[in-house]
């Protein structure tokens, strides 16, 4: 038996998320350790509830003096996690979120992991590698993605409502076939998620099923529903 409800069928189409780690091979050596400060900034969408690993620039361990992770989250004081190689000492300042940790001991691996990613982890993460040749930076603008909950129902005569609830960022809704649609409504929640609602009407009585297609960075979903007969439309002419 199908798990799909009888007339309303949901689907996850194509998931478009990047992998959970953008780490390069740590054995890579930064070319000719120039005195110029190397600054790399990466925008990175990560799905909520997954794990993420953020990496430092690929600097040889023997050239390191200090590794510092700076974490700037909305509405919170800046958190720093640092490791001094000379003393093998780690230090934390203003870091209260236990889900953000070193992958292992910093002398083994300088990567930072978020396990699991929560909506509050939206923010800027920067690794600073201090070496005798200068400081090397890698920054991440982490955008936490939240998959919207999608519903479709017929509200009244040949009028359907499709909702993409609490997504981040806002989802986009389209219809097959095109209907007579009211302007899309958006409701913003305090946690940064958005509910998108689209209401459409189909006058043509030859329209049998309508499909709501929801596009989102976490993947696309489509649902369809067979429209009910208009009350009073008893039988078609024979």
């Amino acid at each position: 038996q199908s798990n799909n409800s009888l007339m309303l069928q949901t689907s996850k189409e194509n998931h478009t998320l990047a992998s959970n780690s953008l780490c390069m091979d740590e054995k890579q050596i930064t070319q000719n350790h120039s005195k110029v400060l190397a600054e790399v900034n990466i925008s990175w969408p990560v799905q909520m509830a997954r794990n993420a690993v953020l990496c430092c620039p690929p600097i040889e361990f023997r050239n390191l003096i200090v590794i510092t992770w700076e974490i700037i989250l909305r509405g919170q004081p800046s958190c720093t996690k640092s490791y001094r190689k000379e003393t093998n000492e780690t230090k934390e300042t203003n870091c209260t979120d236990e889900r953000i940790t070193w992958v292992s001991t910093p002398d083994q691996n300088s990567d930072l992991q978020i396990h699991p990613v929560a909506i509050t982890h939206d923010g800027y993460y920067r690794c600073i590698m201090a070496t005798p040749d200068g400081n090397f930076h890698r920054g991440y603008h982490l955008q936490v993605l939240v998959t919207p909950e999608v519903t479709l129902f017929e509200s009244r005569n040949r009028t359907a409502v499709c909702k993409a609830v609490a997504g981040k960022p806002a989802a986009q809704i389209s219809w097959i076939p095109a209907g007579d649609c009211a302007p899309t409504e958006q409701e913003y929640w305090g946690n940064g998620t958005v509910t998108v609602k689209s209401t459409c009407h189909w006058e043509g009585h030859n329209v049998s099923t309508v499909t709501c297609h929801v596009s989102h960075l976490t993947g696309n979903k489509s649902l369809y529903i067979e429209l009910l007969p208009v009350p009073g439309a008893k039988k078609s002419a024979k």
Partner: antibody, heavy 114, light 107 residues
Amino acid sequence: QVQLQQPGSELVRPGASVKLSCKASGYTFTSYWMHWVKQRPGQGLEWIGNIYPGSGTTNYDEKFKSKATLTVDTSSSTAYMQISSLTSEDSAVYYCTTGTSTYWGQGTLVTVSA
Amino acid sequence: DVQMIQSPSSLSASLGDIVTMTCQASQGTSINLNWFQQKPGKAPKLLIYGAVNLEDGVPSRFSGSRYGTDFTLTVSSLEDEDMATYFCLQHTYLPWTFGGGTKLEIK
């Protein structure tokens, strides 16, 4: 578990009528459209029409408007299709289907023969 | 009525092959579509609903895709049990219309 039960076969005379049944179970019969589909031996599938059991509303393909009549008995959760003025062209397997074509009956083979 | 043009009408392939068949909606109509497998003497079995979604219990070697009003069913690694006739169905407009079918034979 959604099930649509149809009798296996019907043998009928040319010019007569036949009433095919489709007994539904495992879901709310009155809330979902029931569709009927024809398949001639070795041929493709043709949509005949549909009925909404909650109101009795029907739609027919133009080709079948004077040939088929769809009805329901909500007390027994059964959909019916009556085919009239039978000819050899009506010899086919007839299926009922619901759930936007997710669920199908096993089909009834109608043979029109003198 | 929306016509569904299905091609090819038949194809022969070897075990392990990748096979594709297509359905095209007439007049560039925007529709939604399901794919079915039918074996002799049996009712059609839903494989793909909403053009791209695998029905529960259907092997993952079956997949559907859409490009505008062109729809494709792909079987990624043909098996003996896939020998059957495949149909598409557009269910957006009444009357519902089926493709003419693709008969898949194993070489």
